[in-house]
């Protein structure tokens, strides 16, 4: 996150970090004890994914951390990286054992399709992650967060030569300086409703980060809530 | 205690104190010996009964006030004069999370998993120890809403 602030421990308890063999590479959100939602482009064939919940400072081990292996990764069925790496950029990760919910490890709320859309249109959301804090710069060690305004579709379409499909939305600042960035992918865009946060987007892509006249592009969660709920049902 | 006799007595005093000449709130209170009843009387005495014209629609109940009135609407209606169908599309039916219409076409509020409807039937309160989307760490000073 570029231009964000340090989160306090437990401020975004639904946020998780995805870790590969060597380094962290993406974010995600807790759906329930056994499932995490992330971006489909975060899943690399043949790479073992470890999910870290309750993470705050990546540079030191913390008692709040819970590490889990991913035993099943399910990108949305229309996702096809060879055609478009960022279209339908959403995936579910099944964990090898349930997370223990507490003040630092809590699921994000997911409303139905209509309400997720309504919440998105409130106009402001919060994004968070341990991604780069400067364009092409270093990654954050302490979880960062940023309040981002929704950008109307027409403005967003004018800002880029790339396709912005109906299952994507844009958020950010025309003047630049504040945006999600590499390493934040898969993390949450949430909208707060009367003190309760609902998932409204998945951090997906952008041209550079925090550039003037450019915006962050997010997967529109409303399009996928039925699929998320159906796949992540706890029996 | 004969309440009929009492009412007659109050009416007589009221005629004398407030109808034959202008009385103050304090004088009216001496007649009623009860603030609530005095206030009711006073609202109409000062500027007439705004409820006289039956402004409340759809079976709403009118309460007179000084220079104004208030409609208490029947379930399913809202607005100043109860002229609007209570609907989820207007202010989300006053629900804090979700709103839907039940079989009688009444607005019913509901909550996401892990929450239940509070006593006011509009707000949602946690129903599990760690409900979704809630920050439960007590020392967090930064509010998300700036």
């Amino acid at each position: 996150v570029v231009g964000g602030e340090d989160a306090e421990r437990g401020q975004f308890p639904w946020q998780v970090l995805l870790h590969g063999e060597i380094a962290a590479f993406c974010g995600g959100s807790i759906v329930n004890e056994k499932w995490v939602v992330t971006a489909a482009h975060c899943i690399k064939p043949g790479v073992k994914i470890t999910v870290v919940a309750g993470e705050h400072n990546t540079e030191k081990p913390e008692p709040t951390e819970q590490k889990r292996n991913v035993i099943r990764a399910i990108p949305y069925h229309s996702y096809n990286a060879s055609i478009n790496k960022y279209s339908h950029d959403i995936a579910l990760l099944e964990l090898d054992e349930p997370l223990e919910l507490n003040s630092y490890v809590t699921p994000i709320c997911i409303a139905d399709r209509d309400y997720t859309n309504i919440f998105l249109k409130f106009g402001y959301g919060y994004v968070s992650g341990w991604g780069k804090v400067f364009n092409r710069g270093r990654s954050a060690s302490i979880l960062q967060y940023l309040k981002v305004p929704l950008v109307d579709r027409a403005t967003c379409l004018r800002s880029t030569k790339f396709s912005i499909y109906s299952h994507m939305f844009c958020a950010g600042y025309h003047e630049g300086g504040k945006d999600s960035c590499q390493g934040d992918s898969g993390g949450p865009h949430v909208t707060e409703v009367e003190g309760t946060s609902f998932l409204t987007g998945i951090i997906s892509w952008g041209e550079e980060c925090a550039m003037k006249g450019k915006y962050g592009i997010y997967t529109k969660v409303s399009r996928y809530v039925n699929w998320i709920k159906e796949k992540t049902k706890l029996t | 205690y004969n309440s009929g006799k009492l009412e007659e007595f109050v009416r007589g005093n009221l005629e004398r104190e407030c109808k034959e000449e202008k009385c103050s709130f304090e004088e009216a209170r001496e007649v009623f010996e009860n603030t609530e009843k005095t206030t009711e009387f006073w609202k109409q005495y000062v500027d007439g009964d705004q409820c006289e014209s039956n402004p409340c629609l759809n079976g709403g109940m009118c309460k007179d006030d000084i220079n104004s009135y208030e409609c208490w609407c029947q379930a399913g209606f809202e607005g100043t004069n109860c002229e609007l169908d209570a609907t989820c599309s207007i202010k989300n039916g006053r629900c804090k999370q979700f709103c839907k219409r039940d079989t009688d076409n009444k607005v019913v509020c509901s909550c996401t998993d892990g929450y239940r409807l509070a006593e006011d039937q509009k707000s949602c309160e946690p129903a599990v120890p760690f409900p979704c989307g809630r920050v439960s760490v007590s020392h967090i000073s930064k509010k998300l809403t700036r």
Partner: antibody, heavy 125, light 106 residues
Framework: QVQMQQSGAELVKPGASVKLSCKAS????????INWVRQRPEQGLEWIGW????????KYNEKLKGKATLTTDKSSSTAFMQLSRLTSEDSAVYFC??????????????????WGQGTSVTVSS | QIVLTQSPAIMSASLGEEITLTCSAS?????MLWYQQKSGTSPKLLIY???NLASGVPSRFSGTGSGTFYSLTISSVEAEDAADYYC?????????FGGGTKLEIK
């Protein structure tokens, strides 16, 4: 191609310890878990645990915790399992197996796809 | 732990016959794996997510199921199919295997 080569048969006395090895080749050793599974004579398969060579993290079957200790040597792409305080109940064939993501229909599923040939451990005085 | 119960324990089949082996789980699992183990060898992955065949597995093998009930079908048994068959779950710790079904060819 992927291969898992296990060490030879062992005959050990009760109360002793033994260290079995499993050399992996044909893939990036640090990127996938190594599982250990045992099979007692005329019995089914029992999962012992896994180790992730990338960071050394482990997960054990609680029932066998303290019995088995899993380690790896990245330089030789070898996984080890030390069995301690052996009893006749521990006589079995011990297998190592790589677990990897299998892709199907765009999704990825974990499975133990390549197995070693097994090491027979006999505990007898 | 999740207990997997396989039935029958032993099955005898004629060449060309269609057979079905079943695996019942004590709790719901998200998917099932099946392994084949021939005498004196290590187990071989047969089916890796309830119904998908591992590389090199003949198409006469198929799997189905969900929740607590899964099955493995061999549409036309061949002599080389004589082996022990194990179902295996990854959904919760400890990972567990069924007790196995021994397939004998008449």
């Amino acid at each position: 191609q992927v291969q898992m080569q296990q060490s030879g048969a062992e005959l050990v006395k009760p109360g002793a310890s033994v260290k079995l090895s499993c050399k992996a080749s044909g893939y990036t050793f640090t990127s996938q878990d190594i599982n250990w599974v045992r099979q007692r004579p005329e019995q089914g398969l029992e999962w012992i645990g896994w180790i992730f060579p990338g960071d050394g993290s482990t997960k054990y079957n609680e029932k066998l915790k303290g019995k088995a200790t899993l380690t790896t040597d990245k330089s030789s792409s070898t996984a080890f399992m030390q069995l301690s305080r052996l009893t006749s109940e521990d006589s079995a064939v011990y297998f190592c197996a790589r677990s990897a993501y299998y892709r199907y229909d765009g999704s990825y599923y974990y499975a133990m796809d390549y197995w070693g040939q097994g090491t027979s451990v006999t505990v007898s005085s | 732990q999740i207990v997997l119960t396989q039935s029958p324990a032993i099955m005898s089949a004629s060449l060309g016959e269609e057979i079905t082996l079943t695996c019942s789980a004590s709790s719901s699992v998200s998917y099932m794996l099946w392994y084949q183990q021939k005498s004196g060898t290590s187990p071989k992955l047969l089916i890796y997510t309830t119904s998908n065949l591992a590389s090199g597995v003949p198409s006469r093998f198929s799997g189905t199921g969900s929740g607590t009930f899964y099955s493995l079908t061999i549409s036309s048994v061949e002599a080389e199919d004589a082996a022990d068959y194990y179902c295996h779950q990854w959904s919760s710790y400890p990972r567990t295997f069924g007790g196995g079904t021994k397939l004998e060819i008449k």
